[in-house]
Interface confidence: low
Amino acid sequence: YKLVCYYTSWSQYREGDGSCFPDALDRFLCTHIIYSFANISNDHIDTWEWNDVTLYGMLNTLKNRNPNLKTLLSVGGWNFGSQRFSKIASNTQSRRTFIKSVPPFLRTHGFDGLDLAWLYPGRRDKQHFTTLIKEMKAEFIKEAQPGKKQLLLSAALSAGKVTIDSSYDIAKISQHLDFISIMTYDFHGAWRGTTGHHSPLFRGQEDASPDRFSNTDYAVGYMLRLGAPASKLVMGIPTFGRSFTLASSETGVGAPISGPGIPGRFTKEAGTLAYYEICDFLRGATVHRILGQQVPYATKGNQWVGYDDQESVKSKVQYLKDRQLAGAMVWALDLDDFQGSFCGQDLRFPLTNAIKDALAAT
């Protein structure tokens, strides 16, 4: 099984114990590590952070001791903007320039492949996204001709039904991608006006979302039925939680909220908590399991957080094994307890290790 793990370059800027550099990563934990994110400037793939090249080096030296480890560079992301991607992909010349720039950049910096994180193609971009993937793969095949190992090509896809329908020709893009990471999280957010888990495995009777599509099981099943081969589908598991501020004395699933939860001490983003911040939060909190959805949430005062723990990730891994998927994807290593100092287990990366162990279990 693949264990595809994202590392985010901006995690270096978190304060104190929240700061994470690639040299803190465990070289034997994941089969693939994806560095997020690269930029595109003047139609060429480019660095994003001022010290990206240094960080690329740190990451890729992990392969010295584990030659089986593969590293990929992810291009795009939330801050990149869908419009910029759209302009490049829809223009033949821009697309060709971008595609041509990728292999030398990856080779120079020691990466084994590219991950496309176009978040998200619009309805009119669907065909262009397919073309981009098809042409990128063709370039990788051609570039590898002189006996080099072919560069890998993957994509991170939304798990939302509406986005899947409008953005992706699943059957076609699956032919050209080496694997697909399906982002089976962020199904529920503060915009709904109620509490709800952002990454349920199944749609439990408790689910307050207005449809039957907002769960991992549905998204995976939908992708499979739209033509994604199980052997290429990698299921996303979050090492972060989504939090809410309760608006009343109700604390269950579907309770009214006044907005996102208060920012974490290190991640400093309202409505999001890293797993290591959740471990802190759990001291003195009340933990509940949403039985049908097979995930936990915790409440303390007027704060509510839905998250994944070692038990829920094991359930998710069992599920992906039952569906014969290619493996699991983790967003993100730097949101797990990467130092092993927060969650009281004396273990670095407790969630990702639980996923790894569950994948290895017979």
């Epitope: 439990g204 039925r225 049908g292």
Partner: antibody, heavy 123, light 110 residues
Framework: QSVKESGGDLVKPGASLTLTCTAS?????????ICWVRQAPGKGLEWIAC????????TYYASWAKGRFTISKTSSTTVTLQMTSLTAADTATYFC????????????????WGPGTLVTVSS | AIKMTQTPASVEVAVGGTVTIKCQAS??????LAWYQQKPGQPPKLLIY???DLASGVPSRFRGSGSGTQFTLTISGVECADAATYYC????????????FGGGTKVVVE
């Protein structure tokens, strides 16, 4: 391919009854949802419950049916509806029906129906 | 909870005529609406799904339209065989609903 309901009977108020839906020519795989719908004499259709045959955890009930009705997948070709504390208002023809989705993501539509089984609750 | 309201409850139409049945959802259901036909002593039959797509084997005189909260079933060139009760059904969600079906419209062909 067909489905057929069985188990309908004349029972007294307060009694319990289990109806069975049996598939022929196909099995209840992950591609299907199976639902129960009832129709009181001379009245309209009333949805009771559905189960995702591929994930038996996924059961959904009409708000009025929760607690008194239980839908279960009992084998690869049978789904049951257990009914408790029956009253005269539960007198109806009970239909079992299969969701039409060949591809997941279409709405929840029922394109394969059984002939129905009559449940009469009377003292 | 989504509530489906169907109008009229009953309608008479001459052979060859046109009949229009309306269905209103209490909140948006996108295009996830189906129409069924039911004749006495028989189970319902799926006619239209996704608001406007004809189910297999359904004649083209049946036409569905609408999205969001307002939907219409139109039967043109009505035949005697079309005498039945017609139900709309929202297929958007089965969470926290009392009934997915509308109340029904009885079509009497003269």
């Amino acid at each position: 391919q067909s489905v057929k309901e069985s188990g309908g009977d004349l029972v007294k108020p307060g009694a319990s009854l289990t109806l069975t839906c049996t598939a022929s020519g196909f099995s209840f795989s992950s591609s299907y949802w199976i639902c129960w719908v009832r129709q009181a004499p001379g009245k309209g259709l009333e949805w009771i419950a559905c189960i995702d045959a591929g994930s038996s955890e996924s059961t959904y009930y009409a708000s009025w049916a929760k607690g008194r009705f239980t839908i279960s997948k009992t084998s690869s070709t049978t789904v049951t509806l257990q009914m408790t504390s029956l009253t005269a208002a539960d007198t109806a023809t009970y239909f079992c029906a299969r969701d039409s989705r060949v591809v997941a993501g279409v709405g929840m539509y029922l394109n394969l129906w059984g002939p129905g089984t009559l449940v009469t609750v009377s003292s | 909870a989504i509530k489906m309201t169907q109008t009229p409850a009953s309608v008479e139409v001459a052979v060859g005529g046109t009949v229009t049945i309306k269905c209103q959802a209490s909140q948006s259901i996108g295009i996830y609406l189906a129409w069924y036909q039911q004749k006495p002593g028989q189970p319902p039959k799926l006619l239209i799904y996704d608001a406007s797509d004809l189910a297999s084997g359904v004649p083209s005189r049946f036409r569905g339209s609408g999205s969001g909260t307002q939907f219409t079933l139109t039967i043109s060139g009505v035949e005697c065989a079309d005498a039945a009760t017609y139900y709309c059904q929202q297929g958007d969600t089965i969470y926290n609903v009392d009934n997915t079906f509308g109340g029904g419209t009885k079509v009497v062909v003269e």
